[in-house]
Interface confidence: low
């Protein structure tokens, strides 16, 4: 979590002198409570916006907007604390709007916004706006929170952001998978314009089950420049196990910009249509427990064979 680097952060508007400050997320009013505190924000809205850094990099940012309630408590409003919590890491970042003049009622409702929190693709955040000073212990809460899910790099606008492009989002492998005779799968995909290696991760499952019955990894060496954007064809030999018929093929690139952590693409081959009275699937021993998320170290099993070639 960080702030977009280059802009002078502004919160002043006509009728209000205001400055944006870094915050420890622990406002002084927590420690030294005040008797009179403002009411909570109204209509908190979080939207996905995009902003460029001075270097020209494009980042997704959280656009935070809220309004004030039309009550007398705005006379005691000294500012606001904006907090963004990344839910999977518990990382929190805060900034503080410090009002340098007192708010007055005017015809239009007071509205505030801030668009400088950089967010990560595919991550979920909790955004909180706390009016300051914070309430006394057991006082009515004067904050509003909303969760905000950032789209992943598949999203059209996200795809061209710097974090997504450095994860390989512009590469579209256009994977095709076909079942051949003699327990084989033919995998074809488009190589990217970088001399880097790829891994194909094959995981097979029984019909309607999520425990793998076969796993295999195949390594594809780095293509030569004349092979960039060409199709690479790989034939994978499957385990001859009755009922082990649903195959997930995942292609993991190792682009220089993301190495172990590049975006993976996958395709799935479904089991053939089941007859009315399906044969019972024989017992099998899963090679290991189902995948619980893609490890940045690769998964594999020592069985199965494969070969490949680049197709011109």
């Amino acid at each position: 979590l960080r702030l977009l680097d280059h802009r002078a952060l502004v919160c002043s508007q006509p009728g209000l002198n205001c400055t944006v400050k870094n915050s420890t997320c622990l406002d002084d009013s927590w420690i030294h409570p005040r008797n009179l505190t403002p009411s909570s924000p109204k209509d908190l809205q979080i939207q996905l916006h995009f902003a460029h850094t001075q270097q020209g990099d494009l980042f997704p940012v959280a656009h935070i907007e809220w309004t004030l309630q039309t009550d007398a408590s705005i006379l005691y409003l000294e500012g606001a604390e904006l907090s963004v919590l990344q839910l999977n890491t518990n990382e929190r970042l805060c900034v503080k709007f410090q009002f340098l003049s007192m708010l007055q009622h005017h015809r239009k409702r007071w509205r505030f916004s801030f668009s400088h929190f950089v967010v990560d693709p595919g991550q979920e955040y909790e955004v909180t706006v706390h009016h300051l000073p914070k309430p006394i212990p057991d006082g009515d809460p004067n904050h509003q929170s909303k969760n905000f899910l950032v789209p992943d790099c598949e999203h059209a606008r996200m795809k061209v952001t710097t974090p997504c492009m450095s994860s390989g989002s512009l590469w579209d492998p256009n994977i095709t998978v076909e079942t051949l005779e003699a327990h084989q799968l033919r995998v074809s995909f488009t190589l990217w314009n970088e001399s880097t290696h790829y891994q194909i991760l094959l995981t097979s499952f029984p019909h309607m089950e999520n425990h793998s019955c076969f796993e295999h990894m195949h390594h594809i060496p780095a293509p030569r420049p004349e092979e960039f954007h060409q199709r690479s064809n790989v034939t994978l030999t499957l385990r001859n196990l009755k009922g082990c018929c649903r195959h997930q093929v995942q292609i993991q690139p190792f682009f220089s910009s993301c190495l172990n952590d590049c975006l993976r693409h996958s395709a799935t081959v479904s089991c053939p249509e089941m007859p009315d009275t399906p044969e019972p699937i024989p017992d099998y021993m899963p090679l290991w427990e189902p995948r619980s998320g893609s490890s940045d170290y690769k998964d594999d099993d020592d069985k199965g064979s494969s070969h490949h070639h680049h197709h011109h």
Epitope: N88, D296, Y297, K298, D299
Partner: antibody, heavy 118, light 107 residues
Framework: EVQLVESGGGLVQPGGSLRLSCAAS????????MNWVRQAPGKGLEWVSF????????YYADSVKGRFTISRDNAKNSLYLQMNSLRDEDTAVYYC???????????WGQGTTVTVSS | DIQMTQSPSSLSASVGDRVTITCRAS??????LAWYQQKPGKFPELLIY???TLQSGVPSRFSGSGSGTDFTLTISSLQPEDVATYYC?????????FGPGTKVDIK
């Protein structure tokens, strides 16, 4: 020069907390997954925790699950290990280590010593 | 979880001897295995990855072999500077367990 430098070790009482840091330099830290590995006095290596480059994947050894938290700040080229509810058996030299594309860990820090004792 | 075992736990050999250390995984891990050397008071150093690929800068007297569950680290001609403890580590999926180590010294 590719370098990892750990800090934050020290003497702490059982039940106490420590935060270890690992400062990376000489490579694009934000592109690499990272690990913490520890070694108790006179014992072997024990893998402790893993975090992927964008913090999207995190793993812990069973022995530290629920007590230790791994995190990173790519803007600061830093890796962290927050250690709570420390026990005598957490006494060890703690190393941060960078995984190599293709496997294994090819860059290690010099280690920082954590002693848990009353 | 997959367990890693090493044998022997320690060995003494003469300079110039061929030394073999074995590492066994309780389940198949393909070639997702690394070998490390750790000298007393130092941090570990990667010797071999992908079971048999020599890490850059490592002397050619070190070699690795094996796939699936059984792996071997061989020092073709033991040198005084090879006195160390050697560890294997699996990295196919978490936990990324190390073997208990094999201590090598000179007779």
């Amino acid at each position: 020069e590719v370098q990892l430098v750990e800090s934050g070790g020290g003497l702490v009482q059982p039940g106490g907390s420590l935060r270890l840091s690992c400062a990376a330099s000489g490579f694009t830290f934000s592109s690499y997954s990272m690990n913490w590995v520890r070694q108790a006095p006179g014992k072997g290596l024990e893998w402790v925790s893993f975090i992927s480059a964008r913090s999207s994947t995190i793993y812990y050894a069973d022995s530290v699950k629920g007590r230790f938290t791994i995190s990173r700040d790519n803007a600061k080229n830093s890796l962290y290990l927050q250690m709570n509810s420390l026990r005598d058996e957490d006494t060890a030299v703690y190393y941060c280590a960078r995984p190599k594309v293709g496997g294994g860990m090819d860059v290690w820090g010099q280690g920082t010593t954590v002693t848990v004792s009353s | 979880d997959i367990q890693m075992t090493q044998s022997p736990s320690s060995l003494s050999a003469s300079v110039g001897d061929r030394v073999t250390i074995t590492c066994r995984a309780s389940q198949g891990i393909s070639n997702y295995l690394a070998w490390y050397q750790q000298k007393p008071g130092k941090f570990p150093e990667l010797l071999i990855y992908a079971a048999s690929t020599l890490q850059s800068g490592v002397p050619s007297r070190f070699s690795g072999s094996g796939s699936g569950t059984d792996f071997t680290l061989t020092i073709s001609s033991l040198q005084p500077e090879d006195v160390a403890t050697y560890y294997c580590q699996k990295y196919n999926r978490a936990p990324f367990t190390f073997g208990p180590g094999t201590k090598v010294d000179i007779k």
